[in-house]
């Protein structure tokens, strides 16, 4: 039901400035998803810029199945995962390595979902039960967003109603919180 399959297609983008972001993803199960880590060597001198357009962000395409109770989509859907840390575009390596290669001394820039798309999905059910039609919200693009101290202190809470779609394999958090763990709304869903 979680991350059923994926394609590790890393795309480097230089996204535009936008509205308040969804909180960035903190994916828990990195065994089931091939998450791209920033790779390469650290620069000799700290890179500082105030222009977000100079920061680049990695989009990973992956596929997953949509489920609803015992029912599952006939075909997987494809969406993006926005790979955590943003780095200076000119220093972003072509190869995906493992090491953390750049750490800003100033404000934190995160790679977060920018645009979403809705997709209608037909789910097939066992035991002769009628198929179900559902809509899912998929990440369509990512962007770099400067996180202020407020963002960090508020644990990246939702800034708008249309904020987050939780990652599969995680506890859902859109507009809600777990009854057992009284945690912040939309806790790190994105």
């Amino acid at each position: 039901q979680g991350w059923q399959a994926f394609k590790n297609d890393a795309t480097e983008i230089i996204p535009e400035l936008g509205e308040y972001p969804e909180p960035p993803p903190e994916l828990e199960n990195n065994k089931t998803m091939n998450r791209a880590e920033n790779g390469g060597r650290p620069p000799h001198h700290p890179f500082e810029t105030k222009d977000v357009s100079e920061y680049s962000c990695r989009e990973l395409h992956f596929t997953r199945y949509v489920t609803d109770g015992p029912c599952r989509s006939a075909k997987p859907v494809t969406e993006l995962v926005c790979s955590g840390q943003c780095g200076p575009a000119r220093l972003l390596p072509n190869a995906i390595g493992r090491g953390k290669w750049w750490r800003p001394s100033g404000p934190d820039f995160r790679c977060i979902p920018d645009r979403y798309r809705a997709q209608r999905v037909q789910l097939l059910c066992p035991g002769g039960e009628a198929p179900r039609a559902r809509k899912v919200r998929l990440v369509a693009s990512c962007k770099c967003k400067r996180l202020t101290r407020f963002h960090n202190q508020s644990e990246l809470k939702d800034f708008g109603t249309e904020a987050a779609r939780p990652q599969k394999g995680r506890k859902p958090r859109p507009r809600a919180r777990s009854a057992k763990a009284n945690q912040a709304e939309l806790e790190n869903a994105y």
Partner: antibody
């Protein structure tokens, strides 16, 4: 802010038809399913059906087939419920609701309109 | 059609009292498809708990939900005046069906 604004109360005569509206703000109805529910005075909730405004495809409970027609106009971000051949049994409050998108494999109506009261009386 | 039966239909609780509302389903459903709504007199319903146990935004943590298969419940650990309302269980599989509702009053 997500809101569903429904049309005002209606007093209609038996045998007539009525068309209720549900205008969305804060989201695009094309991206969601819109549901309609009936609540008779001092009674429970009854699902009528839903529509996918993106393609106009609607689903109904058998009981409401022929009685209700759900349509949508994406240009005005509005969904409609038309009720025909009205009788006293149709006197109720009708609510529209939005089916939330993908709550991590949970699907439920997460926002409701304020309701439209329909009274059928001669 | 799946039928949801709620019990009790009407109950009264004192402030601080623990409250449990039961919802019995005519045939087994996935816990992801069972939800609860709260409705106060003269207002529209509000999604209260979704997927059996997940609280919707703004719902106090004194509320909880549990269950599986054909038996589900909503629990308030300590009744407060603002909790007086009618609670509906509902399931959404191929059709949306609601329980008949439990009216909870303040004693």
């Amino acid at each position: 802010e997500v809101q569903l604004q429904q049309s005002g109360a209606d007093l209609v005569k038996p045998g007539a038809s009525v068309k209720l509206s549900c205008t969305a703000s804060g989201f695009n109805i094309k991206d969601y399913y819109i549901h309609w529910v009936k609540q008779r005075p001092a009674q429970g909730l009854e699902w009528i059906g839903r529509i996918d405004p993106d393609n106009g495809e609607s689903t109904y409970v058998p009981k409401f087939q022929g009685k209700a027609t759900i349509t949508a106009d994406t240009s005005s971000n509005t969904a409609y419920l038309q009720l025909r051949s009205l009788t006293s049994e149709d006197t109720a409050i009708y609510y529209c609701g939005r089916e939330g998108l993908d709550y991590g494999d949970y699907y439920a109506v997460d926002y409701w309109g304020q309701g439209t009261s329909v009274t059928v009386s001669s | 059609e799946i039928v949801l039966t709620q019990s009790p239909a009407l109950m009264a609780a004192s402030p601080g009292e623990k409250v449990t509302i039961a919802c019995s389903v005519s045939s087994s459903i996935s816990s992801t498809n069972l939800h609860w709504s709260q409705q106060k007199s003269g207002t529209s319903p509000k999604l209260w708990i979704y997927g059996t146990s997940n609280l919707a935004s703004g719902v106090p943590v004194r509320f909880s939900g549990s269950g599986s298969g054909t038996s589900y419940s909503l629990t308030i650990s300590s009744m407060e005046a603002e909790d007086a309302a009618t609670y509906y269980c509902q399931q959404w599989s191929t059709t949306y069906t609601f329980g008949s509702g439990t009216k909870l009053e303040l004693k």
